[in-house]
Amino acid sequence: MMTGTIETTGNISAEKGGSIILQCHLSSTTAQVTQVNWEQQDQLLAICNADLGWHISPSFKDRVAPGPGLGLTLQSLTVNDTGEYFCIYHTYPDGTYTGRIFLEVLESSVAEHGARFQIP
């Protein structure tokens, strides 16, 4: 039975040209995290494998940095980066947990972080 929950940074906004940290946290389970995948729609951004370390997709290599922790730092933001991002936790023995973050990249300097929220 899957008992875990994923807490994410929720709905967030950032300025064009700036950077943002995408962060998820898995709690309420003793399952072992074997891998975390970061995706934007059907595009892979990065994978953090517990044994093998980080793999950043070649499409994002110049502006995605691993961390902090299992999170991901997105740099040199453009308006096209606006959209949904997903953290997919592969765990044993529970299976897969998915968290969602919505990022809005703004032209102006009024960007501010949204509230944290949980996905069961």
Epitope: N37, Q43, D51, W54, T96
Partner: antibody, heavy 120, light 107 residues
Framework: EVQLQESGPGLVKPSETLSLTCAVS????????WNWIRQPPGKKLEYIGY???????YYNPSLKSRVTISRDTSKNQFSLKLSSVTAADTAVYYC??????????????WGQGTTVTVSS | DIVMTQTPLSLSVTPGQPASISCRAS??????IAWYLQKPGQSPQLLIY???YRYTGVPDRFSGSGSGTDFTLKISRVEAEDVGVYYC?????????FGGGTKVEIK
């Protein structure tokens, strides 16, 4: 140029342990990760598992109870042991190298393969 | 495990003509797909990784595309040296799994 060379007995009796070694030349095993893959006659490639640069191992759950992958960095080689073999373990066995950081799970240097037949 | 299904099973192509091989994953695998060519009597060799990136030294007549569950390997103009069995592989999650292969031969 990196070369991988599999070696081991071509014939193994049922219920015995299959033992193969992959010798790596032209590159140090202290980075990247090192895989075993097999291909039974007329069937698809099957992933067996890996040993990482740090010595951590992953085994395909379908074989996990019977598989051990180890390494000897002083000899720059890694090994596969598969216990309690049956005719279904008859296959061409390949060792291969992966660079997770750059290529994820894509394996880009392969040995030539060694045929193992399980028969009494 | 994620099941990878390739079509067609075999393909007979006239030299200089294009060829296309499809690979479908049983669940979304983003862009974590590699393509290999196993020439007769040889071990598999990496052609494409991350769905669309050619590995070092691979001729530009090979191209990969797709994301999610559906992927395609295209050869723009088939040459005699392209014969063999082509495999797709996913590395979205462990265990890594392969397609059943597509045999390409020259007419």
């Amino acid at each position: 140029e990196v070369q991988l060379q599999e070696s081991g007995p071509g014939l193994v009796k049922p219920s015995e342990t299959l033992s193969l070694t992959c010798a790596v030349s032209g590159y140090s095993m202290t980075s990247d990760y090192w895989n075993w893959i097999r291909q039974p006659p007329g069937k698809k490639l099957e992933y067996i598992g890996y040993i990482s640069y740090s010595g951590r191992t992953y085994y395909n759950p379908s074989l996990k109870s019977r598989v051990t992958i180890s390494r000897d960095t002083s000899k720059n080689q890694f090994s596969l042991k598969l216990s309690s073999v049956t005719a279904a373990d008859t296959a061409v066995y390949y060792c291969a190298r992966g660079d997770y950081s750059n290529y994820g799970g894509a394996m880009y240097d392969w040995g030539q393969g060694t045929t193992v037949t399980v028969s009494s | 495990d994620i099941v990878m299904t390739q079509t067609p099973l075999s393909l007979s192509v006239t030299p200089g003509q294009p060829a296309s091989i499809s690979c479908r994953a049983s669940q979304g695998v983003s862009t974590t797909i590699a393509w290999y060519l196993q020439k007769p009597g040889q071990s598999p060799q990496l052609l494409i990784y991350s769905a669309s990136y050619r590995y070092t030294g691979v001729p530009d007549r090979f191209s990969g595309s797709g994301s999610g569950t559906d992927f395609t390997l295209k050869i723009s103009r088939v040459e005699a040296e392209d014969v063999g069995v082509y495999y797709c592989q996913q590395y979205y999650s462990s265990p890594f799994t392969f397609g059943g292969g597509t045999k390409v031969e020259i007419k």
